[in-house]
């Protein structure tokens, strides 16, 4: 069962004093998702016992493995379930506890009640102050029973459940009709699976006998075992104070677990601690009584005397539960109850034991679960005991369960079942997950989930150049932190795969699946300079680079130009595929800015170091287009442009540039100025006779503006071949050609 | 679904006796008190007789008291009314009810299932 | 003389609301139920507890208790409500008494 105990402090003259806290033997119990388990849930549990709303209640972690519940402001804050959650996956356990007010009306005789199936269970509560009105029995909220108040029996009003079965378990209460759901009195019902001493999936398995009020697990036969004892039959007492699977865990405050109500996992329920009784856990057991709620009885012989935590403490020469065993008989000794090993080894198991006459090889035995007798390969004979060894063939799971060892001499005999728990070795159900790369180094994440048994002791990470048939490289990882591969060959795939261990002999898992990595190009080491940059418009620049020389191939596969604009926080990127190129064309960009310019040489997607950075002013946009462009041939090698000036100018023009291109030529347009930006018509000739010519043209302030609509237009006929057109304005005094 | 369906009614001469029945279904009947009322023609319901699921407690309307006698039999789910020394006064139709709880904060008794009664008249 | 009285009869305007009262001691230490009854027809539950009302009754029913007086209140009321309504309580003893009853007529 998981190791989960929830505690309530029940001393209840003051409700802010009153605590639950929720506390886990559990490994790793707690801590969150960063490690193997879920964390403690600790809350109240309104889904049946419905208080009236009050302040939130705070929960406080105290380290990984407990967590608190306090700001209770009033007593019926407290009344109701609580629950507290933890271990993890199929493991995962709900502990319940019931809160009856101290002042109800109807209280509790016994609070948990821990039934077989099949039994007859009786709830009894008893009138603490009287109404003489009916008592209405719920089960889970929901109406089950009413009984006349004239139908108690010797103060006690009682709820016969004949024949349980587990779906019969839950929370009951007994409340006067019309009464505050407060004054109720609350029971928890628990029915095991299976009749008395079974467990299993039919029932069909014999429990190992837990002793000191421990309650066998119906579904794993375990012995969930009072608060102060343990040991795989709870033989075993703990010291005052201690409890928790191992006595781990010590009870708080100096009255040790006075006023404390211990609950434990189903099919347990809840309890005073070993040595404690009554409703609020505060009266020490009368004499001749131990244990949880004092319900044990000493009954010791032989001149033992009765702790109220322990039981019966031994004279010399006298052993057992109520000292009636001589030491004369045979005893096992020092046995362990609980043994783990991992699938499929051999483990050697030891059993000592002593008596009068003393016990020889061939009278200690060993007993598997199926009843398979194993006799002892070797025996060491020592003054007070003879240990002898038992080599186990190799374990298969059907080996988990109940082992038992038994001595047999003339002077009587003895015998200890210990738990055996066989553990599968966890196998990773995925592969591992790649961080990062670089060319030399791989950064993993080893943590995968897996199948099998935990806890996780080791993670190693194997790996090796796919392909290869050399030896794997190992390197054993903690489990919780990234692993980072060194020492790799760059562009190369890797095979890595997780292999997990257990503790144990034989606690290594098979490896887990395979996962290609592959390592980056080297890094390109080269730096760049800026050659020099021209502006080629208001949104274009042209720019060159060089690159130092250096002997043998270029490591790079191209260029990355970055474009900072500070104004805005923008950056342009713009990828030169080819590492021969030492010149780039950057157009798109926003004109009158202020960029940052710098280059850097890439491999794969490796970048070196950046040149160091030019700054570039962009000229601002220029003027609107001019309007209603027109093209009127005036002979065989000239042609007149008329148009309009552009409208909404934002300053004054300082030029006019014309394209002038031979429609459906292949060749560069040619730009004449037009320096005259008042004029409004200019000529342009030198042009060829009868061919046809596009023209378009743009005014420039600062920089050169939007162009006009396109215009066509044929010079005359047949006159000689010019040596190409130039252009005069009209109106222009001078008539120089241009 | 819950069903009460009551039987036994009939003319009987005062006096006389008559034991109604009322047959339980759709619930675990000895978990529940049940209850007989009736309603002479005419007039308003009127509480005769009550029964707690063990059939250890009883009471009755002062009207009915020492003449009347509910039973039930858990086993065989049914609720009983034994009327002896009828008086013509007794004439009504007899329902039996179901006695209900809320499940809210107070549990408040109320009666949410009825059958659909039965008539008896004692008239010479 | 019963111990749970109500007004013999009380007429609302179709549509109109209506408050049908029930008056008694018991009703300061028990909580009251009400039930509708057409002629020919066993007795329905409609109101019980501090304001219950039970599966397939329309909120225009509701009820409250205020003293020794125990109301059942309908809005809005139809041509169906038209019925006779009683009011029920109980004792310690688990004896239970019926009121009168009070005939609703909708005009």
């Known amino acids: 069962a998981v190791d989960l105990t929830l505690l309530a402090n029940l001393r209840l003259t003051d409700p802010q004093r009153f605590f639950l806290t929720c506390v886990s033997g559990e490994a790793g119990a707690g801590r969150g998702s960063d490690a193997w388990g879920p964390p403690l849930l600790l809350e109240k549990d309104d889904r049946i016992v419905r208080t009236p709303p009050g302040p939130p209640l705070r929960l406080a972690r105290n380290g990984s493995h407990q967590v608190t519940l306090r700001g209770f402001s009033k007593p019926s804050d407290l009344v109701g379930v609580f629950s507290c959650v933890g271990g993890a996956g199929a493991r995962r356990t709900r502990v319940i506890y019931v809160h009856n007010s101290p002042g109800a009306h109807l209280l509790p005789d016994k609070v948990t009640h821990t039934v077989n199936k099949g039994d007859t269970a009786v709830l009894s509560a008893r009138v603490h102050k009287e109404k003489q009105t009916d008592v209405i029995w719920k089960s889970n909220g929901s109406y089950f029973y009413t009984l006349d108040w004239h139908e108690a029996q010797d103060g006690r009003f009682l709820l016969q459940l004949p024949n349980v079965q587990p779906p019969s378990s839950g929370i009951y209460s007994a409340t006067y009709l019309e009464a505050s759901p407060l004054g109720s009195a609350f029971f928890r019902l628990i029915v095991r699976g299976c009749g008395a001493g079974r467990w299993g999936p039919g029932c069909t398995k014999e429990c190992p006998g837990c002793l000191h009020g421990g309650v066998c697990h119906d579904h794993d036969g375990e012995c969930v075992c009072p608060p102060g004892f343990t040991g795989t039959r709870c033989e075993q007492a703990c010291r005052e104070g201690r409890f928790g699977q191992s006595c781990q865990e010590q009870c708080p405050g100096i009255s040790g677990c006075r006023g404390l109500t211990f609950c434990l996992p189903d099919p347990y329920g809840c309890s005073c601690g070993s040595g404690w009784r009554g409703s609020q856990c505060q009266e020490a057991c009368a004499p001749g009584h131990f244990g949880a709620d004092c319900r044990l009885q000493c009954q010791c012989q032989n001149g033992g005397t009765c702790d109220r935590f322990s039981g019966c403490v031994c004279p010399s020469g006298w052993h057992g539960v109520h000292c009636e065993k001589s030491d004369r008989i045979p005893q096992i000794l020092n046995m362990a109850s609980e043994l783990e090993f991992n699938l499929e080894t051999m483990p050697r198991i030891n059993c000592a034991a002593a008596g009068n006459p003393f016990p020889v090889r061939g009278s200690i035995e060993l007993r598997k679960p199926d009843g398979t007798v194993l006799l002892s390969t070797k025996a060491i004979v020592e003054p007070e005991k003879t240990t002898a060894e038992f080599e186990v063939p190799r374990l298969v799971l059907a080996d988990s369960g109940f082992w038992e060892c038994r001595v047999s001499t003339s002077g009587g005999q003895d015998s200890r079942r210990f738990k055996v728990n066989v553990k599968v070795p966890p196998v990773p159900l995925a592969a591992p997950r790649l961080l990062t790369k670089q060319s030399r180094q791989l950064v993993v994440s080893p943590l995968v989930s897996f199948s099998g048994d935990g806890p996780i002791s080791t993670v190693r990470l194997h790996y090796r150049p796919q392909d290869s048939t050399m030896d794997w490289s190992t390197i054993v990882v903690d489990p919780s932190e990234n692993v980072t591969l060194m020492n790799l060959r760059p562009k190369t795939g890797y095979s890595v795969r997780v292999q997990l261990s257990r503790p144990g002999e034989g606690g290594e898992g098979a490896w887990g699946p395979p996962t290609l990595m592959t390592t980056d190009c080297p890094e390109p080491l080269l730096q760049p300079w800026l050659e020099g940059w021209h502006v080629e418009g208001t949104d274009r620049l042209r720019v060159s680079w060089s690159l130092p020389l250096v002997p043998g191939p270029l490591v790079g596969d191209g260029f990355l130009l970055r474009l900072w604009d500070g104004t805005r926080g923008q950056e342009r990127r713009e990828n030169v595929s080819s590492p021969q190129a030492r010149t780039a064309l950057l157009t798109g960009l926003t004109p009158g800015t202020h960029y940052q310019l710098d280059v850097q040489l890439y491999h794969c997607t490796l970048l070196g170091p950046a040149s160091p950075p030019a700054h570039v002013l962009l000229p601002p946009s220029g003027p609107p287009a001019p309007r209603h462009l027109h093209a009127q041939a005036l002979s065989d090698s000239e042609i007149q442009l008329t148009w309009k000036h552009p409208e909404a100018l934002p300053g004054p023009i300082s030029k006019y540039v014309v394209e002038v291109q031979v429609a459906g030529g292949a060749g560069d347009p040619l730009w004449i100025d037009v320096d005259r930006p008042e004029e409004t018509s200019t000529i342009i000739r030198g042009l060829n006779a009868s061919t046809r010519y596009l023209f378009r043209m743009r005014a420039s302030i600062q920089g050169l503006g939007d162009w006009s609509n396109t215009v066509e237009e044929s010079t005359l006929g047949n006159g000689l071949q010019a040596e190409g057109p130039v252009q005069e304005s009209r109106a222009a005094e001078e008539g120089l050609d241009q | 679904e819950v069903q009460l369906l009551e039987s036994g009614g009939g003319l009987v001469q005062p006096g006389g006796s008559l034991r109604l029945s009322c047959a339980a279904s759709g619930f675990t009947f000895s978990r529940y008190k049940m209850i007989w009322v009736r309603q002479a023609p005419g007039k308003g319901l009127e509480w005769v007789s009550s029964i707690y699921p063990s059939g250890g407690t009883t009471s009755y309307a002062d009207s009915v008291k020492g003449r009347f006698t509910i039973s039930r039999d858990n086993s065989k789910n049914t609720l009983y009314l034994q009327m002896n020394s009828l008086r013509a006064e007794d004439t009504a139709v007899y329902y039996c009810?179901?006695?209900?709880?809320?499940?809210?904060?107070?549990?408040?008794?109320?009666?949410?299932?009825w059958g659909q009664g039965t008539l008896v008249t004692v008239s010479s | 003389q019963s111990a749970l009285t109500q007004d013999p009869a009380v007429s609302v305007a179709l549509g109109q609301t209506v408050r049908i009262t029930c008056r008694g001691d018991r009703l300061r230490s028990y909580y009251s139920s009400w039930y509708q009854q057409k002629p020919r027809q066993a007795p329905v539950l409609v109101m019980f507890g501090r304001n219950n009302r039970p599966s397939g009754i329309p909120d225009r029913f509701s009820g409250s208790t205020s003293g020794s007086t125990a109301s059942l209140t309908i809005t809005a009321t139809q041509a169906d409500d038209e019925a006779d309504y009683f009011c029920?309580?109980?004792?310690?003893?688990?004896?239970?008494?019926f009121g009168g009853g009070t005939k609703l007529t909708v005009l």
């Open positions: 029920s309580s109980r004792d310690g003893s688990g004896n239970f008494l």
């Open positions: 009810a179901r006695s209900d709880l809320g499940s809210g904060w107070y549990s408040a008794e109320y009666f949410q299932h």
